[in-house]
Amino acid sequence: DLKVEMMAGGTQITPLNDNVTIFCNIFYSQPLNITSMGITWFWKSLTFDKEVKVFEFFGDHQEAFRPGAIVSPWRLKSGDASLRLPGIQLEEAGEYRCEVVVTPLKAQGTVQLEVVASPASRLLLDQVGMKENEDKYMCESSGFYPEAINITWEKQTQKFPHPIEISEDVITGPTIKNMDGTFNVTSCLKLNSSQEDPGTVYQCVVRHASLHTPLRSNFTLTAARHSLSETEKTDNFS
């Protein structure tokens, strides 16, 4: 009996530019002889429904149809037919199929590969055209993929034990696609500093599929309206 097992859940998520290993494990009732077996990896793009050969291994012959693709012969001996792809790109997301032949038996498994890019975040103070005691803080998130992103603003006052989500005076712009396929977006918070308590911490919170925990950039309102620290005066408040 020949069986192939892929990543549990049927989906693997990998960061952009990572050296990804797409898992494929072979289970066979007898010891594997790699000279009399074959491994072929196929890829089907998210946009085209056509399957393309990525890598093949037959006996003493192996060929990478995607530059850098490799299946380790040493690991193959112990049943590990995982495919390593260095420098994975966004457009390489899709369905990967691992096909194993141990004559006369054949087994296969498929996995969806998702490529994600984590956003970078920076906080900027824009005072151009603002009224007295009014400030506009901009939270820029850039270089993320996929497009879905959630940006919220929170404040933490001195007195209350938990943060508070701010919903008023927040405008989040449309996402903009970059040349490399990643996205950028900016969210703005308008603050009337005369109505806020000094010592209140404001935070831009970015949640995205690529992040285990939210990305946070913060600033603290001081008694003097514009007394931001030097690091805050540049770009990054985090």
């Epitope: 001195q158 007195k159 938990h162």
Partner: antibody, heavy 117, light 107 residues
Framework: QVQLVQSGAEVKKPGASVKVSCKAS????????MNWMRQAPGQGLEWMGG????????DYNEKFKGRVTMTVDTSTSTVYMELSSLRSEDTAVYYC??????????WGQGTLVTVSS | DIQMTQSPSSLSASVGDRVTITCKAS??????VAWYQQKPGKAPKSLIY???NRYDGVPSRFSGSGSGTDFTLTISSLQPEDFTTYYC?????????FGAGTKLEIK
């Protein structure tokens, strides 16, 4: 990292007073507000009051007004909660708690105060 | 004072179950609600703030929802360590008030 270390367990007679301390470390002490909570055995949580750690202001639960006093010693980064005219129903675990960051708020380990004749 | 009415007071469930705990505020508290988990002999640990935001490090199986007066804490797939007591808390105004708690027990 932030730590709130409270004083040890106390046994008091009815009518007496108790003073529980909470020593803070790992952050700029005076820029925070400290709350005090209590929990009677097998019961829920109850907010008693809070104090701004620069010592500027306090806010007490009406239920405890006149019996509770919260003070700060900034030189030792310690906050105190004193409860007077103790009765048996004041038997509880008393906690000091500080506003959190993004892993949640910080709590002391608790101080058990037993009021018994 | 704002009353927080939590239900049920106790709940029996099995590992892997999905459970929901509700909390009703006596007046509008917006989204100023937090949820705590408390294990026996330990200080409470905060799970959720602003009704629906998980604190960093809290497993994704915990989720909160609601606004105004009605709030829920949902545990999507119970793990053995989740069988303990949960409290809601409003923090829109002083005095801070808590629900009476929900004890989650193994069926």
């Amino acid at each position: 990292q932030v730590q709130l270390v409270q004083s040890g367990a106390e046994v008091k007679k009815p009518g007496a007073s108790v003073k529980v301390s909470c020593k803070a470390s790992g952050y700029t002490f005076t820029s925070y507000w400290m709350n005090w909570m209590r929990q009677a055995p097998g019961q829920g949580l109850e907010w008693m009051g809070g104090i701004y750690l620069s010592g500027e202001s306090t806010d007490y639960n009406e239920k405890f007004k006149g019996r509770v006093t919260m003070t700060v010693d900034t030189s030792t980064s310690t906050v105190y909660m004193e409860l007077s005219s103790l009765r048996s129903e004041d038997t509880a675990v008393y906690y000091c708690t500080r506003r959190g960051d993004y892993f949640g708020d910080f709590w002391g380990q608790g101080t058990l105060v037993t009021v018994s004749s | 004072d704002i009353q927080m009415t939590q239900s049920p007071s106790s709940l029996s469930a099995s590992v892997g179950d999905r459970v929901t705990i509700t909390c009703k505020a006596s007046q509008n508290v917006g989204k100023y609600v937090a949820w705590y988990q408390q294990k026996p002999g330990k200080a409470p640990k905060s799970l959720i703030y602003s009704a629906s935001n998980r604190y960093d490090g809290v497993p994704s199986r915990f989720s909160g929802s609601g606004s105004g007066t009605d709030f829920t804490l949902t545990i999507s797939s119970l793990q053995p360590e989740d069988f303990t007591t949960y409290y809601c808390q409003q923090y829109i105004s002083y005095p801070l008030t808590f629900g009476a708690g929900t004890k989650l027990e193994i069926k």
